[in-house]
């Protein structure tokens, strides 16, 4: 059943969607598999805090501990990755803060992507000292499990030495790894003893074994790659926005709604209004009016600007954002003060000046 009555028909018209919204990305907390993660809910004056993951209620279990404003995840796994939210319920309102958890290893196995120190791994031996292959930098091989978000680049390294200089080849799940086994193939940098796969996809999951050998012996090392799929999600609105604002009669004010959405968002600014002297319809639902929405003939829909305000403009303003997956909304109040008789220009107080450009 609808939660409000619209004053006018707001069937959404065709829109022009030229922009991709990647605004106000939620804070990201990164943990390696097996590590523990602790996050504090960054909301003030929280009487009761509830937690969700990917829109589903999160309760305590043997690995998840909820103590006051803290969320603890023990022995994190890639499945703990996702969009988390804490909601602070107060006596008069509630507020939600979103953050991402990414349980993943770094891009490369133990060093930076640019391989600046790679030349050190290429060890030259005295030609008289024949030697079977050996690892030259085991620290770069310690992390065997690599949980990587889809579309990222993965690099596995097996720095080795030996005399004569060993050769390196790679296996996937125990079989020869061929270029045609994945779209885009892969790169092998022999000088850096590395395998590089760009834009990984779920089918890249598996065990990758480097085999390093010369005529005196052979050694191998196996990495496990897990590709964490991302999936589309409903819009996220930056906590605390729009912010409450106040101004004098005749002043100007702006409300800002910061949106993060993978899919194209439809933004609406809605206000509670009166119709025939009543704030509520016959069904008991409040009357709402759409003041602005994204699409044709609409400038930056994330900002609602009110000019030369009157006392009638006071009230609650709702930023409502929808994509094809779901919805999110947050609201703010506008207080309109009587115009002071003092000489000189009134100073208007705008919402969230930090976010205005």
């Amino acid at each position: 059943r609808p939660s409000f009555s619209l004053v006018e028909d707001t069937t959404l018209e065709p829109e022009e969607p030229p922009t991709k919204y990647q605004i106000s990305q939620p804070e990201v907390y990164v943990a390696a598999p097996g590590e523990s993660l602790e996050v504090r809910c960054l909301l003030k004056d929280a009487a009761v805090i509830s937690w969700t993951k990917d829109g589903v209620h999160l309760g305590p279990n043997n690995r998840t501990v909820l103590i006051g404003e803290y969320l603890q995840i023990k022995g994190a796994t890639p499945r703990d990755s996702g969009l988390y939210a804490c909601t602070a319920s107060r006596t008069v309102d509630s507020e939600t803060w979103y953050f991402m958890v990414n349980v993943t290893d770094a891009i490369s196995s133990g060093d930076d992507e640019d391989d600046t120190d790679g030349a050190e791994d290429f060890v030259s031996e005295n030609s008289n000292n024949k030697r079977a292959p050996y690892w030259t930098n085991t620290e770069k091989m310690e992390k065997r499990l690599h949980a990587v978000p889809a579309a990222n680049t993965v690099k596995f390294r097996c720095p080795a030495g030996g005399n004569p200089m060993p050769t390196m080849r790679w296996l996937k799940n125990g079989k020869e790894f061929k270029q045609e086994h994945r779209i885009g193939g892969y790169k092998v940098r022999n000088q850096h003893w590395s395998l590089i796969m760009e834009s990984v996809v779920p089918s890249d999951k598996g065990n990758y074994t480097c085999v390093v050998e010369n005529e005196y012996g052979s050694i191998n090392h196996t990495y496990h790659l897990d590709v964490v799929e991302r999936s589309p999600h409903r819009p996220i609105l930056q906590a605390g926005l729009p912010a409450n604002a106040s101004t004098v009669v005749g002043g100007d004010v702006e409300f800002v709604c910061k949106v993060y959405s993978d899919a194209q968002p439809h933004i609406q600014w809605i206000k509670h209004v009166e119709k025939n002297g009543s704030k509520y319809g016959p069904d008991g639902l409040p009357y709402l009016k759409v003041l602005k929405h994204s699409g044709i003939n609409s400038s930056n829909a994330e900002v609602l600007a009110l000019f030369n305000v009157t006392e009638a403009d006071a009230g609650e303003y709702i930023c409502k954002v929808s994509n094809y997956i779901g919805q999110a909304n947050q609201s703010a109040w506008l207080t309109v003060l009587p115009k002071q008789q003092a000489p000189g220009r009134e100073k208007e107080i705008t919402a969230s000046p930090d976010y205005l450009e």
Epitope: S3, E15, P17, Q264, H266, N323, G326, Q327
Partner: antibody
């Protein structure tokens, strides 16, 4: 496991009305739009509209306004679509889908006198 | 409304062959989705947000494009890929689908 289960095949007379259902399980029903799609025999796909169960918001394709009525019962995690004043043009398979990656198996509607 | 035009309407390919089909939009879009449908079955999501592979979809499928021009590529055709493919936009109301490309096996 996410599942969307739609009601079975319907045979109706011209001028009549029908109601089909889409029962969901395995995900938070209220958090996602439920879209309805029409596919005429041997034809392509048409978006009818969508309902957001959490608050009852509905968006219709203008073409189907007055023809389709979408509702949802959150306690049963089920979405419904009513089709009225049926004609032969309404004979089709109707799908419910959420997020684009969860689909029902389809309800076949045949309108015939 | 945004009209999506798919081409070709019908095509055939031999096993192992590379297949590319296109979808042209009447207005610029942010993203495109692609579906596969076989007779008697529901559509199956292959690609979302233009280039993201949906869960469980073989890596031989890929999507690309921007603005008004998008494409779906199958790197190596397999017999099980014979189906009708639809592009769809979730950017602008009313959401619309292309007319479909029917892919047959030679």
């Amino acid at each position: 496991e996410v599942q969307l289960h739609q009601s079975g095949t319907v045979l109706a007379r011209p001028g009549a009305s029908v109601k089909m259902s889409c029962k969901t399980s395995g995900y938070t029903f209220t958090n996602y739009w439920m879209h309805w799609i029409k596919q005429r025999p041997g034809q392509g796909l048409e978006w009818i509209g969508a309902i957001y169960p959490e608050n009852g918001d509905i968006n219709y394709n203008q073409k189907f306004k007055g023809k389709a009525k979408l509702t949802a019962v959150t306690s049963a995690s089920t979405a419904y679509m009513d089709l009225s004043s049926l004609t032969n043009e309404d004979s089709a398979v109707y799908y419910c889908t959420s997020r684009g990656d969860y689909w029902g198996q389809g309800t076949t509607l045949t309108v015939s006198s | 409304q945004i009209v999506l035009t798919q081409s070709p309407a019908i095509m055939s390919a031999s096993p192992g062959e590379k297949v590319t089909m296109t979808c042209s939009a009447s207005s610029g879009l942010s993203y495109m989705s692609w579906y596969q449908q076989k007779p008697g079955s529901s559509p199956r999501l292959l690609i979302y947000d233009t280039s993201n592979l949906a869960s469980g979809v073989p890596v031989r499928f890929s999507g690309s494009g921007s603005g008004t021009s998008y494409s779906l590529t199958i790197s190596r055709m397999e017999a099980e890929d014979a189906a009708t493919y639809y592009c769809q936009q979730w950017s602008s109301y009313p959401y619309t689908f292309g007319g479909g490309t029917k892919l047959e096996i030679k």
